[in-house]
């Protein structure tokens, strides 16, 4: 009660930073746990369309804001044609999935590959065929598809005509696109993600300018974009819930990403307050309206009163509970570069277990899908990616401890990524794939890295055996 009074936030997440053993959910003495994950744990791997598909203007695909951004903002990157060419080498991706033995494959649909100018009219036949073929192949292999509708590749036409996510007109257009996807693919897709990491879309797309569309310095635009992303997600959830769930019987969520942070002084109430503020300003910004009370976190409302849009009472009611599980992303994109505002002078940490505990306490112990997790290696590293294995072991150990020791309801894990590909502002200077791809080669062979062998073993053993 005292901490709540002092820190002024509605949830209970700040208990994570208390070093009182009776009060702290995480027992730091449990360094490694040799145990298995729950039976039927959902093991998967993911990719983002723009990162791996290539063929950015092939077969009638329209340009996305990222295709444009690459040509205007990123030096020494000609186009995503240099990527892993998943659009051409679908069979190779399927073989890679077979090799690892995953239960699910998380991929995103390129909106402009289906609708070149973003507006839902007649779909681009080749694009439709590609995703349909992929889904059929996954079903055949007993690999569950988890499909993301928006992983940052907004059709350029919508940016140019409406100003992209700054304009609330996009909400209905996105809903039309989602409706089409539900109609065409919903018979084969039981897990949908509306938007991948909206925080990065808003923060880097409109704040730092590091992501497409490359606008910067307008905090009001950042929060308007966030507002429209939340409302778009909510609209799509209600649409799915009302019109598609009854017969398709699937689940829908939004992937929210975050960093983790530790106080400089664990006994200092104000440092703990800053850590709470830090998490709230990144994860809570989107999680509170969707998984919480339907509104922005109180601290944000107070401190950003002149730039943060307001939800009406009706909208709060509409936003609240619009996710069937908590899809959580924890990876380098939320850490590098870290928004210094979010750091609040405290210490950034890669403690996924504590982040999961924070979610449990703040949002009433939801079912959690780790929708993106992993680290990166330098682009010069080929198949011997020992750092990636070390990081994966560390992260998976933390997830296992969260499940077994903290009773957190994690039901699935998405290793990121299946393939080396285009890594946003880092372009091709880093690699995140479990499969190595030589971007200069013609055939773009997928070569399993050490991490692929390691993950395959984890899946086979369903955890860590002694």
């Amino acid at each position: 009660i005292l901490l709540r009074a002092v820190t002024g936030f509605s949830g209970d997440g700040r208990a994570i930073w208390s070093k009182n053993p009776n009060f702290t959910p995480v027992n730091e003495s449990q360094l490694f746990l040799y145990d298995t994950f729950p039976k039927n744990f959902f093991w998967g791997i993911g990719t983002g369309a723009l990162q791996v598909e290539g063929s950015w203007k092939k077969d009638g695909k329209g340009p996305s804001i990222w295709d444009h951004f690459i040509h205007t903002h990123l030096k020494n990157v000609s186009s995503t044609n240099g990527s892993s060419d998943s659009y051409i080498f679908l069979e190779k991706d399927l073989s890679a999935l077979d090799f690892i033995g995953v239960s699910f494959y998380q991929f995103s649909i390129s909106w402009p590959r289906l609708f070149p100018d973003g507006i839902v009219t007649v779909a681009n036949a080749k694009g439709l065929q590609y995703y349909s073929t992929l889904l059929d192949a996954l079903v055949l292999r007993n690999i569950e598809p988890i499909v993301t509708l928006y992983h940052w590749d907004l059709p350029l036409a919508l940016q140019e005509k409406y100003g992209g996510w700054k304009n609330d007109t996009i909400i209905d257009i996105f809903n039309d696109y989602a409706t089409y996807c539900f109609q065409m693919f919903g018979d084969r897709v039981k897990y949908w993600i509306t938007i991948h990491n909206p925080y990065l879309v808003a923060w880097h797309g409109y704040g730092t300018g590091m992501h497409a569309p490359g606008e910067k310095g307008n905090l009001a635009a950042v929060y308007t974009v966030g507002h429209n992303l939340i409302k778009a997600h909510s609209k799509v959830w209600h649409n799915y819930n009302t019109h598609f769930r009854p017969h398709q019987k699937g689940w829908l969520s939004i992937t929210l990403g975050s960093h983790w942070i530790e106080p400089n002084r664990s006994e200092n109430t104000m440092d703990i307050f800053k850590c709470q503020q830090s998490m709230v300003s990144v994860l809570g910004w989107f999680a509170n309206p969707i998984h919480g009370d339907g509104d922005y976190p109180e601290g944000m409302r107070k401190k950003l009163f002149s730039v943060l849009p307001i939800f009406s009472e009706a909208e709060k009611h509409e936003m609240r509970g619009t996710a069937d599980f908590f899809a959580f992303s924890f990876g380098p994109n939320n850490f590098k570069p870290l928004n210094t505002m979010a750091k609040m002078g405290q210490n950034v940490s890669l403690n996924l277990r504590e982040a999961l505990n924070w979610i449990k306490l703040e949002y009433n112990n939801p079912r959690i899908l780790i929708a993106e997790n992993g680290w990166f290696t330098d682009s010069r590293v080929k198949t011997e990616d020992t750092t990636a294995i070390y990081m994966m072991k560390n992260f998976l150990s933390q997830v296992l401890q969260a499940i077994r020791l903290d009773e957190i309801r994690v039901f699935g894990y998405t290793a990121w990524s299946l393939l080396d590909g285009f890594e946003w502002q880092d372009a091709y200077t880093i690699r995140r794939g479990l499969f190595y791809v030589d971007f200069n080669s013609k055939q773009k062979e997928r070569k399993p890295k050490s991490s692929a062998h390691y993950y395959k073993q984890i899946i086979r053993e369903n955890g860590f055996s002694l």
């Epitope: 009163f305 002149s306 730039v307």
Partner: antibody
Framework: QVQLVQSGAEVKKPGASVKVSCKAS????????IDWVRQATGQGLEWMGW????????GYAQKFQGRVTMTRNTSINTAYMELSSLRSEDTAIYYC?????????????WGQGTLVTVSS | DIQMTQSPSSLSASVGDRVTFTCQAS??????LNWYQQKPGKAPKLLIY???NLETGVPSRFSGSGSGTDFTFTISSLQPEDIATYFC?????????FGPGTKVDLK
């Protein structure tokens, strides 16, 4: 370094209007709010309202609603506060203050103040 | 509007003294409270935000505490340059409101 420089003192008759300017330098003008706070001689501080220079959005304290207008000219990094229908109790020093970027209710830099005297 | 009261309205102390005064809000304002220092003929200066966080460059002899409706401001060892009027400000609700101030001078 960050500076807010205000226009000089004004003497106005009751019923008239006054427009005070606040020129910002040393930072990106459009990234921070400008708030206006006044202080009658020997009295406390009274917050009048805010303006976001990026879009020009404003919010005024109820007490000043209908009498105050806050504007800006981004090409010269200057904010303005106009108060109309002046009365003697509006005699005060008027300060512009910068709201922090991520906590806009904390005023980290202030102008030197502009004395407005309302007298017949 | 939220009313802010401060007590005492003025106090006299010697250099090196520990000086404490209070600010009270007419309703719960959580931790949404800032403190400012104003020297004669000058503009106010932000010292503390969110009850107890020192603004960059502010000496550590200044501190703040409290939550809800009752807040305390402390100067651990009064220095001659601390002679000023100190105002609290709430931002729990618009309009933001300031306390009437506590004037600190030397004995």
């Amino acid at each position: 370094q960050v500076q807010l420089v205000q226009s000089g003192a004004e003497v106005k008759k009751p019923g008239a209007s006054v427009k005070v300017s606040c020129k910002a330098s040393g930072y990106t003008f459009t990234s921070y709010d400008i708030d206006w706070v006044r202080q009658a001689t020997g009295q406390g501080l009274e917050w009048m309202g805010w303006m976001n220079p990026n879009g020009g959005n404003t919010g005024y304290a109820q007490k000043f609603q209908g009498r105050v207008t806050m504007t800006r000219n981004t090409s010269i990094n200057t904010a303005y506060m106009e108060l109309s229908s002046l009365r003697s109790e509006d005699t005060a020093i008027y300060y512009c203050a910068r709201g922090k970027e991520f906590s806009r209710a904390e005023f980290d830099y202030w102008g030197q103040g502009t004395l407005v005297t309302v007298s017949s | 509007d939220i009313q802010m009261t401060q007590s005492p309205s003025s106090l006299s102390a010697s250099v090196g003294d520990r000086v404490t005064f209070t600010c009270q809000a007419s309703q719960d304002i959580n931790i949404y409270l800032n403190w400012y220092q104003q020297k004669p003929g000058k503009a106010p200066k932000l010292l503390i935000y969110d009850v107890s966080n020192l603004e960059t460059g502010v000496p550590s002899r200044f501190s703040g505490s409290g939550s809800g409706t009752d807040f305390t401001f402390t100067i651990s060892s009064l220095q001659p340059e601390d002679i000023a009027t100190y105002f609290c400000q709430q931002y729990d609700n618009l309009p933001f409101t300031f306390g009437p101030g506590t004037k600190v001078d030397l004995k």
